[in-house]
């Protein structure tokens, strides 16, 4: 990109540049018309018979450099061939010299700075590539010369350009002073500002376009070359923020349309809202869930919205004493999620009718919640209690939903409790034909013990016909008609209103061999 500092073709008034010295044969300003009939100005000089050592100087007005370090001067000029000039002497030249002088203000006068090299800085001696021939009475013919010179480095606020003629017959048709700058550029969603190069290459920091964010890595930069071109170099640029997608050749970020979203910054375009969600505004990074639908905290922002599951179905219970096996079917509606688990709530009602949440004496296997399989075993049920189990299905969004959690209930009533097994049987007396036994009264939860049943048989005689039973209302009994010196196995069970409890452990006792031993008290 070129920024013009001066273009004589565009000047609408006289240039009125300064000439030196004030003598005949000096540079003179002429006017003409371009193709559009706009007035243009040119300078001519033709002192081919000048005195030796005489130079004609022409100096432009003061030109602010506007931050440029190097300025380019494009000269358009014609040069008469010395041979075409009948009066041309040996001093006729076909070259001229260009100088510049820097200053911080428009301080030059008709006499200062001194009209010579140093203080003026020589740029170049310009020779004509094309010479114009002129025959008397005929029109001059010849091509226009175009020469671009480079001035600098410049450091002061402005400068003057000067032309020194030492015997040429020439016309300076136009002067274009300009500097080169790198035009504002947007690439990879990164905007690089218009930059005037101060060196061969200048690093330029970029900034993200509106609604873009820096990509990971080094901050984006590009190099502005002295010729006003951006150096070709891959740019770690910016990317569109969440809710925006790249558009117009990666130069802008466009808001996602209604009904679409983009959850993350970076490449990629806006996507339609996932199932059960919507976006009512443009620029959505996330789509809002429909009423009753949710995203778990761990769900990606782009995941569909889901809902809690319906209740489990068809709970089947199998009671086995104080143990209960519950089994059920998966809910009809999973809510659109895979993370389905089950949980149980439990209430117990005593025989008297008072109900409360189940106590800590119940155990659940594998557990009361976070069940992944549709079954559970409950142990430690108390007899003659009614239990209500509510089986619920849960998923990752159940905790976000308000309102009651659907469940499938099951009621189970346990049998009334029989007395516990009788243990601690001891022999209080033994004889060759009898055994006197006693035991501790078991604690019967459902009422008192009504009576006991004693079951005994001789050791070794295992058949059912050898087993004998004896009922007693006391917590003792005497077994008669036993064999002398024989071993017997004895079991006792208690009966309450709920029925017989289980037989206790077999107790081993032995009758006496003869009478002489007399009655002997034995400890169990």
């Amino acid at each position: 990109l070129e920024e013009t500092l001066l273009n004589t073709k565009l000047e609408t008034a006289d240039l009125k540049w300064v000439t030196f010295p004030q003598v005949d044969g000096q540079w003179e300003e002429l006017s003409g018309l371009d193709e559009e009939q706009h007035s243009v100005r040119t300078y001519e000089v033709c002192d081919v018979q000048r005195a030796p050592g005489q130079a004609h100087w022409l100096r432009t007005g003061w030109v602010p450099r506007r931050g440029a370090v190097h300025v380019y001067a494009t000269l358009r000029f014609t040069m008469l061939e010395c041979l075409s000039l009948p009066r041309a002497g040996r001093s006729c030249k076909e070259t001229f010299t260009v100088f510049y002088y820097e200053s911080d203000a428009d301080t030059a006068t008709a006499l200062t700075p001194a009209w010579m090299e140093n203080p003026y800085i020589k740029v170049d001696t310009v020779a004509a590539e094309h010479l114009t021939r002129k025959r008397p009475g005929a029109e001059a013919t010849g091509k226009v010369n175009v020469k671009t010179l480079r001035l600098g480095p410049l450091s002061k606020a402005g400068f003057y350009l000067a032309f020194q003629d030492q015997g040429a017959c020439m016309a300076l048709l136009s002067l274009h002073l300009f500097y080169k700058k790198c035009a504002q550029l947007t690439v990879n969603l990164t905007r690089f500002p218009e930059t005037v190069p101060r060196e061969l290459v200048v690093p330029v920091a970029g900034s993200c376009v509106v609604d873009a964010v820096p990509a990971p890595g080094p901050s984006p930069s590009l190099y502005c070359r002295e010729d006003g071109q951006w150096a070709e170099q891959p740019v770690t640029g910016c990317s569109c923020a969440p809710g925006f997608e790249a558009a117009e050749g990666n130069t802008k970020c466009r808001a996602c349309a209604q009904g679409t979203f983009k959850p993350l910054s970076g490449e990629g375009s806006c996507q339609p809202c996932p199932a059960n969600s919507h976006s009512n505004t443009i620029g959505s990074a996330v789509c809002q869930c429909r009423v009753g639908y949710f995203r778990a905290r761990t769900d990606p922002r782009g995941a569909p919205c889901t809902t809690p599951p319906s209740a489990p179905r068809s709970v089947v219970s199998r009671l086995n004493g104080s143990s209960l096996h519950l089994e059920w079917s998966a809910p009809l509606e999973s809510g659109g999620r895979e993370d389905l688990t089950y949980a149980l709530r439990c209430r117990e009602c005593r025989p008297g009718g008072s109900c409360a949440p189940c106590g800590g004496d119940l155990t659940f296997d594998p557990g009361p919640r976070d069940l992944v399989e549709p079954w559970v075993v409950v142990r430690g049920l108390r007899p003659d209690f009614t239990y209500t189990f509510e089986v619920t299905a849960l998923n990752g969004v159940s905790s976000l939903a308000t309102g009651p959690v659907p469940f499938e209930p099951v009621n189970v009533t346990t049998d009334r409790e029989v007395p516990p097994a009788v243990s601690d049987i001891r022999v209080t007396r033994s004889s060759p034909s009898s055994l006197s036994l006693a035991w501790a009264v078991p604690r019967a939860p459902s009422g008192a013990v009504l009576d006991y049943e004693v079951k005994y048989h001789e050791k070794g005689a295992e058949g059912p016909s050898s087993v004998r039973f004896l009922k007693t209302s006391e917590n003792r009994a005497e077994l008669r008609g036993l064999k002398r010196g024989a071993s017997y196995l004895v079991q006792v069970r208690a009966r309450s209103e709920a029925g017989y409890g289980p037989f206790g452990q077999e107790h081993h006792s032995q009758t006496q061999l003869d009478e002489s031993e007399g009655w002997r008290e034995q400890l169990a």
Epitope: K16, Q22, E28, G32, L33, Q37, T132, A171
Partner: antibody, heavy 126, light 108 residues
């Protein structure tokens, strides 16, 4: 001898026409930009019209635009001013004048008039 | 376009310096040319490009131009210098030109 000589002036009625001529000699006419300048009796100079060396560009003062036409015949070294719809206020001495010439480039001219004719009187009266 | 204003008349004693002004908006940014016209004669260019003298014009004629005013100076005025003097510049309207109203110089 470098000179410009005007002719064609005279008495003409309002609304009438007149054609002025200016014969050039002693310089390369086809390299010169030319103008007409007039001077009403007892008044100052007033620029009227101009033409470039090749004759393709012309310019007029607002007071004569649309009524006067400047032209040139480079083969005859002659400049013309065709005056139509003449008015009493057009009464003046009409001078042919040459713009300062370029050394060799007839596309350009200096902004002063460096050569004048002796003038020709045009009287518009009924 | 620019309008040039001159004093109608200036008087000067022989041998003294006569100054004739020509004013216009930002005139210093334009070139001004001066013409001398004696009664019954065609104008003659006496100063061009503000301060340059054509060959054949006496050195007592000089010119300057800055700000809004151009000045023609005749130092050591002579009786033969009595004439009308006109300033002129060009206008932006293509090849248009404009003259000042003229100043009658009387040498007393």
């Amino acid at each position: 001898q470098v000179e410009l000589v005007e002719s064609g002036g005279g008495l003409v009625q309002p609304g009438g026409s007149l054609r002025l001529s200016c014969a050039a000699s002693g310089f390369t006419f086809n390299n010169a930009w030319m103008s007409w300048v007039r001077q009403a009796p007892g008044k100052g100079l007033e620029w009227v019209s101009a033409i470039n060396a090749k004759g393709q560009f012309t310019s007029y003062a607002d007071s004569v635009k649309g009524r006067f036409t400047i032209s040139r015949d480079n083969s005859k070294n002659t400049l013309y001013l065709q005056m139509n719809s003449l008015r009493a206020e057009d009464t003046a001495v009409y001078y042919c004048a040459r713009k300062g010439m370029s050394f060799y480039n007839n596309k350009y001219a200096k902004s002063m008039f460096d050569l004048w004719g002796q003038g020709t009187l045009v009287t518009v009266s009924s | 376009d620019i309008e040039l204003t001159q004093p109608p008349s200036v008087s000067v004693a022989p041998g003294q310096t006569a100054r004739i002004s020509c004013s216009g908006d930002n005139l210093g940014k334009k070139y001004v040319h001066w013409y001398q016209q004696k009664p019954g004669q065609a104008p003659v260019l006496v100063i061009y490009y503000d301060s340059k003298r054509p060959s054949g014009i006496p050195e007592r004629f000089s010119g300057s131009n800055s700000g809004n005013t151009a000045t023609l100076t005749i130092s050591g005025t002579q009786a033969e210098d009595e004439a009308d003097y006109y300033c002129q510049t060009w206008t932006l309207s293509h090849m248009g030109n404009v003259f000042g109203g003229g100043t009658k110089l009387t040498v007393l």
